[in-house]
Interface confidence: low
Amino acid sequence: PHLRTFTDRFQTCKVQGAWPLIDNNYLNVQVTNTPVLPGSAATATSKLTIIFKNFQECVDQKVYQAEMDELPAAFVDGSKNGGDKHGANSLKITEKVSGQHVEIRAKYIGTTIVVRQVGRYLTFAVRVPEEVVNAVEDWDSQGLYLCLRGCPLNQQIDFQAFHTNTEGTGARRLAAASPAPTAPETFPYETAVAKCKEKLPVEDLYYQACVFDLLTTGDVNFTLAAYYALEDVKMLHSNKDKLHLYERTRDLPGR
Amino acid sequence: SPCKILKCNSEFWSATSGSHAPASDDTPEFCAALRSYALCTRRTARTCRGDLAYHSAVHGIEDLMSQHNCSKDGPTSQPRLHTLPPAGDSQERSDSPEICHCEKSFHKHSATPNYTHCGLFGD
């Protein structure tokens, strides 16, 4: 999947299986990524688990779990708030669009999470205070948390290079560069560009991600995934100057 | 698919605050965590044959279950985590009802915290 980190680095990660996105004293988020096509290096998120940890008099521990074709509007115990404590309503799930869009607000830690199902796969977005991000007991023994550290260099796909290489060419030209050898050859570059431009008129990294995804999979739902990801940034990002990211400096994994 | 034992391990680790024999934890909660852990290992068993961490976990679970007299059957709901060290002390004195503490506890020291964003989408 495409990852925008807490430090506004933008990466395309081919990480497969279960990976932690966030882990601190209040919150743990894990995603499971699966290949989008047989033989493809590109992966997308098929499962998401969010654990809101027990917090003082405010909330009991609550676990939210979403999977492909299952975007519940409740925690796994069936509740929609933080439990039986006095401050239970400082944690709330709201269903925005049934089966497609859920918002979780954890006011006691100033955090908003948006989970969507777009096509077969899930998207995740969060707004969280730095104070919460940094609330970890032992920095040195922290593992690999994608939102904080980015994904390891050997798990990154350089989709910008891919995008540059395929500009103005048809799908046959990109077959060698594509991380999905079985990607449909019926999706020319021009069509991908047109579809992405429709939803994402600004040629930023979200637009480039959209083009990459269409060329890689031939699945037009990925246009919507990029579109909604940008919409969620608009809603959640505190710095309105950083909504659109344009070029990625060659990054090393953040560790 | 690859062996997911490290995921099971980290879930158990976080769920029990890393304590092998938590004196302060209620045994039922610890047992529930162990049963969740056991369930997780069973789900990934097929892909973990021969993996050190997997077999180490399986044996460890059996050992811990017997130490804590846990029954194999019972609830597997995630146990309560340890009470978290607050980023800002939510016990500050105030005339507001307790719920208000919860809604503002994270930024007691700064009226408008610096927010940050992370997102994951597409492929």
């Epitope: 023994s141 690999l144 050997n154 | 050190l52 961490a53 180490s56 050992d63």
Partner: antibody, heavy 120, light 109 residues
Framework: EVQLVQSGAEVKKPGASVKVSCKAS????????ISWVRQAPGQGLDWMGW????????NYAQKLQGRVTMTTDTSTSTAYMELSSLRSEDTAVYYC?????????????WGQGTLVTVSS | QSALTQPRSVSGSPGQSVTISCTGT?????????VSWYQQHPGKAPKLMLY???KRPSGVPDRFSGSKSGNTASLTISGLQAEDEADYYC?????????FGGGTKVTVL
């Protein structure tokens, strides 16, 4: 007291096999894995492999695949490591070690070591 | 050659602090929470000093501490004592790779 007691020193000729034993006491034998580690004279530690007494599953270091066999006898709480087609470079002290339980992977109890000398 | 690199030797006077580094790859150290350290006196079996990067087994003095940054794990001995003179090995487990460092001789001057 948790203990691992190993068999005595061995002198072998090149091409022969050696079988080292490691008797565990003071804990539930099937609840922990057993690792085998060797150390050539003046050299560092070299991980050889691991066995689960509970299931019999093994995981061997790639360079020893085909030459090493690890087994256990749960009735006597004993682990065995057999190394075949011995070469002079197999001369080393061989240690068994208990693997920490649960979601931890470390060797928390070690045997006293068995010196195996391979010489013609 | 070991895939985990340690300095051959470090030394310090009694009461000083010494740090031993253990550098690997992202998979062997960077992504692994299973880094442990062993102390070995001449002619003796190794002894577990730290596990899971930072944790100390009971009986190990608190002057031994561990940390990790990126692909490097470190063992620090603060308040060096004569009995700390020994070889120290780091060990990492990630996936099915099990590796020891080449060892570091700590000398108390």
């Amino acid at each position: 007291e948790v203990q691992l007691v190993q068999s005595g020193a061995e002198v072998k000729k090149p091409g022969a096999s050696v079988k080292v034993s490691c008797k565990a006491s003071g804990y539930t034998f099937t609840s922990h894995g057993i690792s085998w580690v060797r150390q050539a004279p003046g050299q560092g530690l070299d991980w050889m492999g691991w066995i689960s007494p509970y299931s019999g599953n093994t995981n061997y270091a790639q360079k020893l695949q085909g030459r090493v066999t690890m087994t256990t006898d749960t009735s006597t709480s004993t682990a065995y490591m057999e190394l075949s087609s011995l070469r002079s470079e197999d001369t080393a002290v061989y240690y068994c070690a208990r693997v920490g339980s649960g979601p931890y992977y470390y060797m928390d109890v070690w045997g006293q070591g068995t010196l195996v000398t391979v010489s013609s | 050659q070991s895939a985990l690199t340690q300095p051959r030797s470090v030394s310090g006077s009694p009461g000083q602090s010494v740090t031993i580094s253990c550098t690997g790859t992202s998979s062997s150290v960077g992504d692994s929470i299973y880094v442990s350290w062993y102390q070995q006196h001449p002619g003796k079996a190794p002894k577990l000093m730290l596990y899971d990067v930072t944790k100390r087994p009971s009986g190990v003095p608190d002057r031994f501490s561990g940390s990790k940054s990126g692909n490097t794990a470190s063992l620090t001995i603060s308040g060096l004592q004569a009995e700390d003179e020994a070889d120290y090995y780091c060990h990492s487990y990630a996936g099915t790779d099990t590796l020891f460092g080449g060892g570091t001789k700590v000398t108390v001057l």
